[in-house]
């Protein structure tokens, strides 16, 4: 047996007209410490009883996990990245078998020089992180490598990374056109074969705050939306105050239901309120009470 401790109630009338009484403090708790009856059924919406209270699943909260939160935590990554798979042909170095072995001194030296050269090429790109050689093969030296780009997460991160990949393409095309061998000699740090430059593939971090918000909102996905504040995404229902999409319930309380957000209007000693936004107040007629 579970006893409910009596609490003061506030009378709320839904915008459809029915009066609802809700506890103004949430202290409906078991009196006895022994587990009696099926505690599992007490936790709704997939919540589970941990022996003391209901552990609720997103987006629910409350004593029995019967209420829907106004906002859901979504955490975009600190940084987002792109990886470009490129191939360039270095003509100023002749391929030797030692270059196949990534732990050889020759490979390490080539890697160092190639990295230095690419750092110079991409020096003006703020998103540029570095290069990673994946394979070296004959011809003179065909260098298969990744160009790594990274930027801080903002709502426009895709545009920033797309722009950076375009600049990478322009810069590598320029250097492999300009730094070429003359009379079998190279005056630059490295020389290239102009026709050997190819962009194989571009992979960009995929993060969609709207998708994460919808997933976490589950059956309320149509009513939760993403709004930005200081470039940070917030997953909110219209019941969360302080956002453009916030519902103003005036003289009432916003509550989420499976049909969306609705206002539960209050009734005070002097007025009752109605309307979709609880903004229509009607004064109660004055009755004299005799004591």
């Amino acid at each position: 047996p579970l006893a409910t401790i009596p609490v003061s109630t506030t009378s709320l009338t839904s915008s459809e007209g029915s009066t609802i009484s809700t506890p103004s403090v949430d202290i409906s708790t078991p009196v006895t410490t022994s587990i009696v009856g099926d505690q599992c059924s007490r936790c709704k919406n997939g919540g589970f009883w941990d022996g003391l209270k209901c552990q609720c699943l997103t987006p629910y909260y409350g004593e029995s996990c019967e209420e829907v939160v106004n906002s859901i935590d979504i955490a975009p990554p600190e940084t987002v990245s792109a990886q470009m798979e490129l191939t360039v042909t270095v003509t100023s170095v002749k391929f030797t078998d030692e270059l196949k072995n990534h732990s050889s001194q020759e490979f390490r030296e080539f890697n160092k020089t190639f990295t230095e050269q690419m750092n110079i090429v991409y020096s003006g790109i703020p998103e540029y992180v570095g290069v990673n050689i994946t394979n070296l093969r004959l011809g003179s030296v065909v260098v298969e490598h990744d160009v790594l780009l990274r930027t801080k997460y903002t709502p426009e991160y895709k545009t920033a990374l797309d722009n950076a990949t375009e600049v990478v393409k322009q810069k590598i095309t320029k250097v492999t056109t300009e730094q070429i061998m003359t009379n079998d000699n190279c005056s630059a740090l490295m020389c290239f074969n102009t026709t050997g430059t190819q962009v194989q593939n571009i992979t960009v971090t995929q993060y969609d705050p709207v998708e994460e918000c919808r997933q976490k909102a589950e059956e309320y996905e149509d009513y939760f939306l993403v709004e930005y504040r200081d470039q940070k995404p917030y997953c909110i229902s219209p019941c969360e105050s302080g956002f453009n999409a916030s519902k103003n319930c005036n003289h009432g309380k916003c509550q989420m239901s499976q049909n969306g957000a609705r206002c539960l209007c209050v009734t005070t000693e002097t007025h009752w309120y109605s309307g979709e936004d609880c903004n229509q107040g009607t004064q109660k007629s004055h009755h004299h009470h005799h004591h």
Partner: nanobody
Framework: DVQLVESGGGLVQPGGSLRLSCAAS????????MAWFRQAPGKEREGVAF???????SYAESVKGRFTISRDNAKNSLYLQMNSLRAEDTAVYYC?????????????????WGQGTMVTVSS
């Protein structure tokens, strides 16, 4: 650890000859590229000549026909025979090496360097 030590520098009259040597230790002389660079006072370091592991050589235009680069793999040594020396050849001469088969006289491509030997051409 790779160590390169130059010798053979000195004072010589215009039209004279000098032979520079570079002893390489810790460097597999049968591989990669060895080169001579020079730096005149107040000027940038410039490539003089380089030689690859297969004996392929290349020279700066200013020294072609006068200087000869060679290497002795058995002795782990590099040489620069300088004939018909001119006043403008006055500089500190450096030996440099790379484990890679390079076709460049860009100094940044060579990770290993000697301390240099001074060559002065003056009457």
């Amino acid at each position: 650890d790779v160590q390169l030590v130059e010798s053979g520098g000195g004072l010589v009259q215009p039209g004279g000859s000098l032979r520079l040597s570079c002893a390489a230790s810790g460097f597999p002389s049968s591989r990669g590229t060895m080169a001579w660079f020079r730096q005149a006072p107040g000027k940038e370091r410039e490539g003089v000549a380089f030689i690859n592991s297969d004996g392929r050589t290349s020279y700066a235009e200013s020294v072609k026909g006068r200087f000869t680069i060679s290497r002795d793999n058995a002795k782990n040594s590099l040489y620069l025979q300088m004939n018909s020396l001119r006043a403008e050849d006055t500089a500190v001469y450096y030996c440099a090496a790379s484990l890679l088969y390079l076709m460049t006289v860009n100094a940044a491509a060579y990770p290993y360097w000697g301390q240099g030997t001074m060559v002065t051409v003056s009457s």
